[in-house]
């Protein structure tokens, strides 16, 4: 029997845990090992998350939202680990969790503040609307509200339209920029301050190329070293714009080092690819090949867009036949 004198009250301390939507997290709690361990995890001081005592879980009064989503590190309880393993966190799980741990001779209470972030990989799109050209930075699902900044030729732009739609658990955001008639380079940065995650989209317009029918054209596409890390998975897509929509010519996946080519006249240099140069060749040009060609290099952290405008003109032979 443990008399009163053994009682130790350890005041509440607070920790912050940041989780990502739909991922698993651990809410930490530790105590000085002792006999007769009782562990109660509660949410916002009201909802029962997890209870353990007399050597086993007791989840009869667990709030239904936590069913099959919580567990303890059972082999480590005797070593003073009362941490909670929490599966598939949602934004509704955000808030304060309290852990009560009692033993025969002491008690501690820990507070853990859970914050949940969302950052589905953003995209940078190039769109033509009638006679206007737009760059659009968008993120389908993000939380909390991100910081979006635009730069033109490395100079911040103050105008920053943001189209925002909020769902129950996150924001969907579009930030369009009218770049009609501009030859500048543009950069869009989306930052999730909670997850400390930043994504950058960069758009570069190359000088127009004039080619004759039946010739071939080389279009450069080399990533900017500031963003590009060859160790990170990325995808390269070459596409051509026709009547306002892009059709994919070829793409390359760094994870499998696979190249898929949809246009027989398109060629990639394997050696150059190994040196992170994704320039391409298009052989035997015809008049319908005139248009805009887009190289898109994308990873979780960036999108690099390079636009080439190609004008294919009739050759002398063809012209004289007409």
């Amino acid at each position: 029997i443990f008399p009163l004198a053994f009682f130790i009250y350890v005041p509440m301390n607070e920790q912050i845990v940041i989780g990502r939507l739909d991922e698993d997290i651990i809410l930490p709690s530790s105590f000085e090992r002792g006999s007769e361990v009782v562990i109660h995890w509660k949410y916002q001081d009201s909802y029962k998350v997890h209870s353990y005592y007399k050597g086993s879980d007791h989840l009869e009064s667990q709030d239904p939202r936590y069913a099959n989503r919580t567990s303890l590190f059972y082999n480590e309880i005797q070593n003073g680990n009362a941490s909670l393993f929490f599966r598939r966190v949602s934004l509704l799980d955000e808030g304060i969790y309290t852990c009560y741990v009692g033993t025969a001779i002491q008690v501690i209470t820990n507070k853990v503040v859970l914050k949940v972030g969302v950052f589905l990989t953003p995209v940078m799109k190039y769109e033509k609307r009638n006679t206007n050209s737009f760059l659009i930075c968008s993120v389908l699902s993000v939380y909390p509200r991100p910081i979006i900044t635009w730069k033109m030729d490395n100079t911040p732009i103050s105008e920053n339209n943001m189209e925002e739609t909020g769902s129950l658990d996150s924001f969907s955001i579009n930030s369009p920029l009218n770049i009609t008639g501009s030859n500048s380079s543009y950069e869009c940065t989306i930052e999730n301050s909670l997850l400390k995650q930043t994504w950058t989209g960069r758009w570069t317009m190359k000088d127009g190329l004039h080619k004759m029918q039946s010739e071939h054209v080389s279009l450069s596409c080399q990533p900017v070293n500031d963003y590009f890390s060859p160790n990170q998975d990325f995808k390269v897509t070459w596409s051509r714009m026709k009547s306002g929509t892009f059709s994919v010519l070829a793409y390359y996946l760094s994870s499998s080092q696979n190249t898929i080519i949809n246009e027989s006249r398109f060629s990639w240099n394997k050696e150059l690819i190994n040196q992170s140069d994704f320039s391409m060749n298009l052989m035997d040009l015809n008049l319908s090949d005139s248009g805009e060609y887009l190289c898109n290099i994308s990873s979780d952290e960036y999108t690099l867009l390079t636009i080439h405008t190609v004008h294919v003109e009739p050759s002398q032979e063809t012209a004289s036949h007409n």
């Epitope: 029997i1 009682f7 009250y9 007769e36 005592y53 007791h58 009692g102 001779i105 002491q106």
Partner: antibody
Framework: EVQLVESGGGLVQPGRSLRLSCAAS????????MFWVRQAPGKGLEWVSG????????AYADSVKGRFTISRDNAKNSLYLQMNSLRAEDTAVYYC????????????????WGRGTLVTVSS | EIVLTQSPATLSLSPGERATLSCRAS??????LAWYQQKPGQAPRLLIY???NRATGIPARFSGSGSGTDFTLTISSLEPEDFAVYYC??????????FGGGTKVEIK
Amino acid sequence: EVQLVESGGGLVQPGRSLRLSCAASGFTFDDHAMFWVRQAPGKGLEWVSGISWSSNSIAYADSVKGRFTISRDNAKNSLYLQMNSLRAEDTAVYYCAKGSIVAGFWLGYFDLWGRGTLVTVSS
Amino acid sequence: EIVLTQSPATLSLSPGERATLSCRASQSVSSYLAWYQQKPGQAPRLLIYDASNRATGIPARFSGSGSGTDFTLTISSLEPEDFAVYYCQQVSGNPLWTFGGGTKVEIK
């Protein structure tokens, strides 16, 4: 019905002994710490003693330490308070109370009370 | 030793009025403080625990606030059945469970 019923109170002379009992029903008795609280006539509440579900943690107020003994019988859903060497200042209504934290002893509140039993110590 | 001091000792109010009861601890008890209501000839009843959480079945007119050493029980609009004695209790110090001296809320 969830309830606590105290018994065993009465008139007793100073220096004598008395044993109080508390019968619990309507809840899982062996999942809860149990407590004795007393209230002298016209006075406030005074915590007397507490016992964990397993009887491994026991606590007493300084005013009764060495004279009173708390115990429980989980098989009988019963709590006891053995009071020895009674004094006039022990005169009070004695309440049995249930601890609020399942299986927890420390930091628990008293979320269920009995109606009390009166102990009068007088010659 | 932690001592809880309740004030005022008596509060004379009319039904419908707001009641504000104070409980001061001689040293910090964090948020480990409860409020109980006791009517004549009855056992106490838990109203508020952990300083601000209402116990099961307690009406919303009862609310608790405070942490550390200063705590308040507020009854937003007194009902006839609310006239009683109210006790605060700390559960985190030495002695482990201590009650304040009580505040009597009586009809004016």
